[in-house]
């Protein structure tokens, strides 16, 4: 004869553990239903009785099979930095990201507990190494023959263009101005690409630099303070 | 956008019910709680209870125990609140909010009220 | 119950100054659970402060919220004619939720 199946809650054989869904309650000494994600447990099982499971409050959520008497507390509300990639459901906790422009730099097990926004590579210096989801822009100075006139956290140094007759020579922090009306464009040595674009200037007018200050890029870390990397910019 | 629409001022004897509706459009109705606070005449705000549209779960002050019934119609994207064994303490004005499940319950929406007077 | 008490109950400020209205619970409250609302007469409230410290868009930068525990506060930097209103905070840490009696901000 086939095995009977037991309704919870039942005693488990000696030596057997309970089913896939279930959990062994010590104080009734049987084995029980585990509430589904988005419940938890509002009264425990007894020899007779099998859990009674209730909705997570407000703002409270289980993610999976459970007995806990209460839910868990979302996480608080996305800062204004911050993007919410996933909404506080009764299954599944917020997850908080960090808006274009920011990098996290305190993660926590799901999002972003910190944000902080990218270092800007000021004018004589370009992007090193862009920033990550995690990780923030690290910038170098621009090698002879490239020069770079912005503050930008996505902006490499570019090659000087190359002149008949210069008007003014190029340095790390703007281009060469030629006298003549057809310049070439030359790649330099040492000049940096990386794997993003870059913006079409016009060759035959000379650029405005832009203002050398940047937004305040400070930001608090439980950790002391660090001086900023060269090339950066900051309070 | 998000708009909370209430029925309009009702005049009521002693003992009688009255039911108020609030309807809701700019928004899914789903993982969000329509509340029902009141306010009589000079005086603050009272949370009278609150209603999960999508599944009908309600809750609410005991103070209200016996006396309010909230009820939705997902058809119509329509919440009402109840409230019999009416008294002159009663007149107030009733108003819905909604709150978004996870916003630890802040009612970023108000309907316009609706004034209850309860007189014999 | 949590009983949620506001004070002043009413205070009268000139634009320009710097107003603070408390809020102190009878239990302690999760600073995710202390709400402040703006209500003009013959209007509903509005949400004004969410989750202690928090602003909706809409609301000026010179209004903040702070505290934690028992003890929360709304902070007017600089009064503006648009800001005299009533104030109630509102805690939704434990049911039945409760809202404070209400801070009347009158013209001076």
């Known amino acids: 004869l086939p095995a009977q199946v037991a309704f919870t809650p039942y005693a488990p054989e000696p030596g057997s553990t309970c089913r896939l869904r279930e959990y062994y309650d010590q104080t009734a000494q049987m084995c029980c239903s585990k509430c589904s994600p988005g419940q938890h447990a509002k009264v425990f099982c007894t020899k007779t009785s099998d859990t009674v499971c209730d909705s997570c409050e407000d703002s409270t959520y289980t993610q999976l099979w459970n007995w806990v008497p209460e839910c868990l507390s979302c996480g608080s509300r996305c800062s204004s930095d911050q993007v919410e990639t996933q909404a506080c459901t009764r299954e599944q906790n917020r997850i908080c990201t960090c808006r274009p422009g920011w990098y996290c730099a305190l993660s926590k097990q799901e999002g972003c507990r910190l944000c902080a926004p990218l270092r800007k590579c000021r004018p004589g210096f370009g992007v090193a190494r862009p920033g990550t989801e995690t990780s923030d822009v690290v910038c170098k100075p621009c090698a002879p023959g490239t020069f770079s006139n912005t503050t930008s956290s996505t902006d490499i140094c570019r090659p000087h263009q190359i002149c008949n007759v210069v008007a003014i020579p190029g340095n790390a922090s703007m281009d060469a101005v030629c006298t003549s009306t057809s310049p070439t464009r030359s790649m330099a040595p040492g000049a940096v690409h990386l794997p993003q674009p870059v913006s079409t200037r016009s060759q035959h007018t000379q650029p405005t630099p832009e203002p050398s200050t940047a937004p305040s890029t400070s930001f608090l870390l439980p950790m002391g303070p660090s001086p900023p990397a060269e090339g950066s910019t900051g309070d | 956008q998000v708009q909370l629409v209430q029925s309009g001022a009702e005049v009521k004897k002693p003992g009688a019910s009255v039911k108020v509706s609030c309807k809701a459009s700019?928004?899914?109705?789903?993982?969000?709680?329509m509340h029902w606070v009141r306010q009589a005449p000079g005086q603050g705000l009272e949370w009278i209870g609150r209603?999960?549209?999508?599944?009908?779960?309600?809750k609410h002050d005991p103070k209200f125990q016996d006396r309010v019934t909230m009820t939705s119609d997902t058809s119509t994207n329509t919440v009402y609140m109840e409230l019999s064994s009416l008294r002159s303490e009663d007149t107030a004005v009733y108003y819905c909010?909604?709150?978004?499940?996870?916003?630890?319950?802040?009612?970023?929406?108000w309907g316009q009220g609706t004034l209850v007077t309860v007189s014999s | 119950d949590i009983q949620m008490t506001q004070s002043p109950s009413s205070l009268s400020a000139s634009v320009g100054d710097r107003v603070t209205i408390t809020c102190t619970a009878s239990?302690?409250?999760?600073?995710?659970?202390l709400h402040w609302y703006q209500q003009k007469p013959g209007k509903a409230p509005k949400l004004w402060i969410y989750?202690?410290?928090n602003l909706p868009s809409g609301v000026p930068s010179r209004f903040s919220g702070s505290g934690s525990g028992t003890d929360f506060t709304l902070t007017i930097s600089s009064l503006q004619p648009e800001d005299f209103a009533t104030y109630y905070c509102?805690?939704?840490?434990?049911?039945?939720?409760?809202f404070g009696q209400g801070t009347k901000v009158e013209i001076k």
């Open positions: 700019g928004f899914n109705n789903k993982d969000i709680y």
């Open positions: 239990s302690s409250v999760s600073s995710n659970y």
């Open positions: 209603i999960d549209p999508a599944t009908g779960n309600t």
């Open positions: 909010a909604r709150s978004p499940y996870g916003d630890f319950g802040a009612m970023d929406y």
């Open positions: 989750s202690t410290s």
């Open positions: 509102h805690q939704y840490h434990r049911s039945p939720w409760t």
